[in-house]
């Protein structure tokens, strides 16, 4: 299926010359950023970006790799070193501390320096580090958190929480001893640590007392409230803020985002994580793109600007299940959200960053033909005379033996959204990977994103670009379009 024009050297020379021309025209903006957006693809390593690019191209009936993703169009790129202070291969909690607070931490801790120890409540106090979002709020900006996971999950929690254990979602998850020592669950911190203008994602059950039925699944006790302290955190949040609204479905979200009287918005669309995009009921639950659009509508009203965190959080979950179909369709929706945000904002005054917290042991190989399905089989057979898929995992639940041997695979199996790609090592869950991840940047001060950097550099670039602590003396011209 080789396109005829690609056989001609002129095609490639012309394309490269155009790219070179665009590169030569790049002018680093010398102004500060009024707005900051960080798009976090959880688990979106470079192999995931490449495979998602091909799938998104193939979804448009093209061959695949030649069609750029929205994130591919960002002019500046760097590599980020994702290790935690105590682990070569990191988790999403300590990485969130790095790219959101600018300080590396220990595995499974959030918003704390590495002087804090996992699960040891008494190491919390005095080791808190402050997120760029918190600093943006103190500077008078509006702030928002959007995710496809629970809003109390590791990545979003990095914007507002300080905890020695990322799994302390509600007080029911916090050991009694830690509660007595004064350690608060993440849901409590969500409503009390700082004033967040927009909160959109999953995580209803951590906000309500045990026994509270869920509005969407009233007959399923396991989906109801989990809190032991009897509190209704949503009610507490609403009571503290005039113009605040709580919504739990897509229709209510759309209405609230268009209502000028709404100044604060909390939308929790599932008891736990939101559904995978392929399982989403589009009448009940908003997509990541729709949540991003709603957040931008509200946040854009502030003349001082905004900080927005947008997470494609279930890319990671698809990979942990060794289900590439899920991971890649989540990545495409994440990229759609980036594209929509680009249409609703200006690169003159908005610094947009796209990155991942870590990678996964997800590989793409086997010499597949151009234009062949990303979920397809490699052209040849393996040494065991069986077929193998071009997408594979180094470890995970895809390791299965059939009569003591690796099972054969057919194309009608490998395309299924439920199919688990095979792996070399059997694990209940596929693991993160430790290689560097990409950082894409566009907007004021995006040119600072270059080379190979520590993951902490991301937070510092955002803080500097918006002249936030500790860079209030940034010496940058005011953002484009402002006069003060």
């Amino acid at each position: 299926i080789i396109p005829v024009e690609e056989e001609n050297p002129d095609f490639w020379n012309r394309e490269a010359a155009e790219a070179l021309g665009a590169a030569k025209k790049l002018q680093p903006a010398q102004t500060a950023a009024k707005n900051l957006i960080i798009f976090l693809g959880d688990g979106m390593g470079v192999s995931t970006v490449t495979a998602a690019r091909i799938l998104k191209g193939q979804k448009k009936d093209k061959l695949g790799p030649e069609i750029p993703l929205a994130m591919d169009r960002f002019p500046y790129v760097a590599l980020s070193k994702t290790y935690n202070v105590d682990k070569h291969v990191p988790d999403s909690g300590a990485t969130a501390t790095a790219y959101l607070c600018g300080v590396k931490g220990n595995f499974q801790t959030i918003g704390l320096s590495a002087a804090a120890r996992f699960n040891q409540c008494n190491t919390t106090r005095g080791n808190e580090v402050i997120s760029v979002m918190n600093r943006a709020k103190k500077a008078g900006k509006s702030v928002g958190v959007v995710t496809t996971t629970r809003v109390q999950h590791a990545s979003p929690a990095g914007t507002y929480a300080h905890t020695v254990n990322r799994n302390w979602y509600s007080d029911a998850d916090v050991p009694a001893s830690a509660r007595q020592e004064g350690c608060q669950d993440i849901a409590t911190q969500l409503i009390s640590n700082m004033d967040i203008d927009v909160i959109l994602g999953g995580g209803r059950k951590y906000m309500f007392r045990m026994g509270t039925p869920d509005p969407e699944y009233p007959d399923d006790y396991s989906q109801g409230g989990t809190r032991l302290d009897g509190k209704n955190l949503v009610q507490e949040w609403l009571a503290k803020r005039q113009g605040a609204r709580y919504v739990w479905n897509r229709t209510e979200l759309m209405q609230a985002s268009l209502d000028p009287s709404v100044t604060h918005l909390m939308g929790l669309f599932e008891p736990g994580d939101m559904k995978y995009e392929i399982h989403r009921d589009s009448t009940l639950d908003p997509s990541l793109m729709e949540m991003t659009e709603a957040a931008l509508r509200l946040l854009s009203r502030n003349p001082r600007g905004f900080f927005l965190f947008v997470e494609g959080g279930r890319i990671d979950h698809g990979h942990h299940e060794s289900r590439a179909y899920r991971a890649l369709t989540e990545t495409i929706m994440f990229d759609d959200a980036i594209e929509r945000a680009g249409q609703l904002t200006s690169e003159e005054d908005t610094l947009s960053l796209v990155t991942a917290d870590h990678s996964h042991v997800f590989s793409f190989g086997g010499y597949p033909l151009r234009g062949s399905s990303i979920f397809g089989l490699a052209p040849g057979k393996a040494r065991d005379r069986k077929a193998y898929t071009v997408l594979l995992y180094g470890n995970g639940p895809g390791y299965v033996l059939k009569d003591g041997a690796r099972p054969d695979v057919t194309e009608s199996e490998s395309g299924s959204p439920e199919y688990r790609q095979q792996s070399a090592v059997p694990l209940d869950e596929e693991t993160h990977a430790g290689e560097d991840v990409a950082v894409f940047a566009r907007g004021p001060q995006a040119h600072l994103v270059h080379g190979v950097q520590e993951q902490t550099f991301i937070a510092h670039v955002m803080a500097f670009a918006a002249c936030l602590e500790p860079y209030t003396a940034c010496d940058l011209a005011p953002p484009a379009g402002t006069t003060d």
Epitope: L55, G57, Q58, K59, K60, D61, K62, L63, G64, S282, T283, Y325, T329, G371, S372, S373, I374, F375, G376, E411, S412, S414, G415, S416, P417
Partner: nanobody
Amino acid sequence: QVQLVESGGGLVQAGGSLRLSCAASRRSFSEYAMGWFRQAPGKEREFVAAIGWSGVIEYADSVKGRFTISRDNAKDTVYLQMNSLKPEDTAVYYCAAGLGIRVVSQTPAYWGQGTQVTVSS
């Protein structure tokens, strides 16, 4: 999830025609490429035709000029018009859906249950 339900199969004389339909259950049907496969007794399932999100169409060499695939996004339905049928077209015909024509023609995500087409000589 996408549920696919085929209809229109049956018994027909060689040289005759049949029109297969496949109704999809998902609202975002128009985002999916749709295809038809067939499986004759004792043989592997083989690709017949596919129509992409953008309207691009592909056919297997064995059916080119005889079969026509089309879709109606308003009705969430894809059709396979089969003319000049031959005994070797006898098979169970399966509807399939996938993310783009490349994917659906090789590794469909979703399959229907199939409808039997028998061409007698």
